[in-house]
């Protein structure tokens, strides 16, 4: 995939972005005590364009998409309390901590923290 | 997929915007002459954000993607003279002209009218 | 829906190569890391290695060490794993699985026989 | 690394019973944060294996409650409350605590 856009040279004014933004996440889990945590969430703005196309078609096919998502992210263990459920008292739930943001390929998926 | 989304509460200061840029669009074939045609192209900044994951799944995985894309084109026919080319002396291609451009759900296909 | 698809059944020659695709779909693919686990005919499960697909980082059991390379391709949400210098022990089903992060194998691909026979 | 000993290799029940595997590991995989880093998988015949159970004691999605898993450190076990016949196949529990992870060597559960 083409590296991201950053600017565009037809809207000089204009620049790409994506933050990681500060959430509070609720998460939960039938029957037991929702926890409320820390979290980032990815939100921007990323550059696309798409240029009309031929057929038969003369050259690649001229569509560009980035899309703000996880630069780096890792899976934490939240434990939840299940009150009146002898068998289960708790629950563990794996939750995607998100570290940083950036524009991607559209295609192209978050990355996760090394093995 | 859901709306694309034109305004964040988070941002409200910021909008997303999709143009159609007019262009000259160079059609080829080889061994034909090239042609100019008046076209447009569709660029812009559209909204994108990914809520993290979690496992075993609460919820439906929170991305959203929208990117700038043609909103309606059709195709039409332009033809190249290929001289020199006895069997082929010309070629018809398919060109599509974009009329009008939109922030639309990344993974759709836009959408063409008939010839 | 989440789907994990390999490549066809492959017949190899002792000393050759082979090399199994596992394509990724209904999931952010890079989200997850990629396992490959073994299974010869009639015999346990045995674990091969495992791949991060955002930055390709891999880790493999010393026995397969020199052997195996395991890539990705984010383009195409495809994982691969090759297997070299075959030889008849290597026959076995072998498995794609996704996981969060370092935890729980939580879908597996339906398998990849290779059969190395002369 | 990480040896798993499962027992018994060989678990002929009766629907409706009761059944329980035992894994153990020759070091401990309870890590510091409190965790037990230890799976259980369920291969039915002609199948690729299915997770029942993660961190020792969570049932996977979609995992009926008849399954329970529990134990720490070195010692665990998968009970089965009441057996059914959906339930046959090779049950295998494995350690994700450190590389390379390894799987125990398997318990065929049949119908008497």
């Known amino acids: 995939a083409p590296p991201p856009i950053n600017k565009l040279a037809l809207f000089p004014d204009k620049s790409a972005w994506c933050e990681a933004k500060n959430i509070t996440q609720i998460v939960g889990h039938s029957g037991c005590e929702a926890k409320s945590i820390q979290n980032r969430a990815c939100l921007g703005q990323c550059f696309s364009y798409s240029v009309p196309n031929t057929f038969p078609q003369s050259t690649e096919s001229l569509v560009h998409c980035d899309s703000c998502m996880p630069a780096q992210s890792m899976w934490e263990i939240v434990t939840l309390e299940c009150p009146g459920h002898e068998e289960v008292p708790r629950v563990d739930k794996l939750v995607e901590k998100i570290v940083h943001c950036s524009c991607q390929a559209c295609g192209k998926e978050p990355s996760h923290e090394g093995l | 997929a859901p709306p694309p989304i034109n305004k964040l509460a988070l941002f409200p200061d910021k909008s997303a915007w999709c143009e159609a840029k007019n262009i000259t669009q160079i059609v080829g074939h080889s061994g034909c002459e090239a042609k100019s045609i008046q076209n447009r192209a569709c660029l812009g900044q559209c909204f994108s954000y990914s809520v993290p994951n979690t496992f075993p799944q609460s919820t439906e995985s929170l991305v959203h993607c929208d990117s700038c894309m043609p909103a309606q084109s059709m195709w039409e026919i332009v033809t190249l003279e290929c001289p020199g080319h006895e069997e082929v002396p010309r070629v018809d291609k398919l060109v599509e002209k974009i009329v009008h451009c939109s922030c639309q759900a990344c993974g759709k296909e836009p959408s063409h009218e008939g010839l | 829906q989440v789907q994990l698809v390999q490549s066809g059944a492959e017949v190899k020659k002792p000393g050759a190569s082979v090399k199994v695709s596992c394509k990724a779909s209904?999931?952010?693919?890079?989200?997850?890391?990629m396992h490959w686990v073994r299974q010869a005919p009639g015999q346990g499960l045995e674990w091969m290695g495992i791949i991060n697909p955002s930055g390709g980082s891999t880790s493999y059991a010393q026995k397969f060490q020199g052997r195996v390379t395991m890539t990705r391709d984010t383009s195409t949400s495809t994982v691969y794993m090759e297997l070299s210098s075959l030889r008849s022990e290597d026959t076995a089903v072998y498995y794609c699985?996704?996981?969060?992060?370092?935890?729980?194998?939580?879908?597996w691909g339906q398998g990849t026989l290779v059969t190395v026979s002369s | 690394d990480v040896v798993m000993t499962q027992s018994p290799l060989s678990l002929p029940v009766t629907p409706g019973e009761p059944a329980s595997i035992s894994c153990r590991s020759s070091?401990?995989?309870?890590?510091?944060?409190?965790?037990?880093?230890l799976d259980w998988y369920l291969q039915k015949p002609g199948q690729s294996p299915q997770l029942l159970i993660y961190?020792?004691?969570n049932r996977a999605s979609g995992v009926p409650d008849r399954f329970s898993g529990s134990g720490s450190g070195t010692d665990f076990s998968l009970k089965i409350r009441r057996v059914e016949a959906e339930d046959v196949g090779v049950y295998y529990c494995m350690q994700t605590l450190q590389t390379p992870y390894t799987f125990g060597q398997g318990t065929k559960l049949e119908i008497k």
């Open positions: 961190l020792g004691s």
């Open positions: 070091q401990s995989l309870l890590k510091s944060n409190g965790y037990n880093y």
């Open positions: 209904g999931y952010t693919f890079t989200s997850y890391y």
């Open positions: 699985a996704r996981a969060p992060g370092k935890f729980p194998l939580d879908y």
